[in-house]
Interface confidence: low
Amino acid sequence: TPEVWVQVRMEATELSSFTIRCGFLGSGSISLVTVSWGGPNGAGGTTLAVLHPERGIRQWAPARQARWETQSSISLILEGSGASSPCANTTFCCKFASFPEGSWEACGSLPPSSDPGLSAPPTPAPILRAD
């Protein structure tokens, strides 16, 4: 069964800056990755970045840099802005659309015990939805 993992890290040098890393553990071909915050995309969350293997990368503030790390993983740097920046319990979700597996999504947030700059290893997060 395909899985999606999500890792959230707060940068030590800039406490309102987050790095989100997501990966797809499956054999299919990825056609689209959507990163959102505040809940799953389409369920109260809002899109931060869309990564398409051919059409390119689209991002919205406070996303500062979205990029492919490998053919099946991406990373996104978020830049916070004072009171309205992401906080430690903000939920980030990644949705991978792949063929033939379909759409798989998982969410994660900063581990509660994390010190800035530290994070748990990128273990698979619970899969919220498979379309």
Epitope: W37, T46, R58, W60, P62, S81, A83, S84, S85, T90
Partner: antibody, heavy 120, light 107 residues
Framework: EVQLQQSGPELVKPGASVRITCKAS????????IHWVKQSHGKSLEWIGY????????GYNQKFKSQATLTVDTSSTTAYMEIRSLTSEDSAVYYC?????????????WGQGTSVTVSS | DIQMTQSPASLSVSVGETVNITCRVS??????LAWYQQKQGKSPQLLVY???NLPDGVPSRFSGSGSGTQYSLKINTLQSEDFGTYYC?????????FGGGTKLEIK
């Protein structure tokens, strides 16, 4: 009827701060981003930033990030923009506008504008 | 940041003529572009979104087209109420910059 009602004109001294309000009505406040746009006299439009009322998420034009702060009060469906350390360069009309979140990206309704004059 | 270059900066035309305004973008924005009309002393109003879609209430004499880095707004059979300043704006990653504007004046 969708309305974005902005606060009245402001005359402020250099170095001071100003807070502009944008009261939204006629739609679900948390379904739309609120954007702020600056227009200096006789000039083009400059995008300042936006705020997402659902979770307070915001994005700024780097040019304005250190000077402007965007906030919302969902209970009163009001968006606010505070601008600090004002100079004559900040004299302009400021607009709020809404954008349906990640749908048809465009600013489909605008406030009437708030004129800010910075003068000693 | 993405740069938006609008042309012409101003245009003097007569009622009944057809007008084309162009917006050149510094990189591919995949049709994520809006056009606005602003009349003197008023707020901008949305004319076109997604490069070619008209919101409800916008007259069909307005049309938007383009893709990649080149977009245009066409006004057929210009009416007296069409005079004003027109702006393009991209929505391909922040900041969502505007073009410099095209002022449409009566000849």
């Amino acid at each position: 009827e969708v309305q974005l009602q902005q606060s009245g004109p402001e005359l402020v001294k250099p170095g001071a701060s100003v807070r502009i309000t944008c009261k939204a009505s006629g739609y679900t406040f948390t379904d739309y981003n609120i954007h702020w746009v600056k227009q200096s006299h006789g000039k083009s439009l400059e995008w300042i930033g936006y705020i997402y009322p659902y979770n307070g998420g915001s994005g700024y034009n780097q040019k304005f990030k250190s000077q402007a702060t965007l906030t919302v009060d969902t209970s009163s469906t009001t968006a606010y923009m505070e601008i600090r350390s004002l100079t004559s360069e900040d004299s302009a009309v400021y607009y709020c506008a809404r954008e349906e979140v990640r749908r048809d990206e465009a600013l489909d309704f605008w406030g009437q504008g708030t004129s800010v004059t910075v003068s000693s | 940041d993405i740069q938006m270059t609008q042309s012409p900066a101003s245009l003097s035309v007569s009622v009944g003529e057809t007008v084309n305004i162009t917006c050149r973008v510094s990189e591919n924005i995949y049709s994520n572009l809006a056009w606005y009309q602003q009349k003197q002393g008023k707020s901008p109003q949305l004319l076109v979104y997604g490069a070619s879609n008209l919101p409800d209430g916008v007259p069909s004499r307005f049309s938007g087209s383009g893709s990649g880095t080149q977009y245009s707004l066409k006004i057929n059979t210009l009416q007296s109420e069409d005079f004003g300043t027109y702006y393009c704006q991209h929505f391909w990653g922040t900041p969502y910059t505007f073009g410099g504007g095209t002022k449409l004046e009566i000849k």
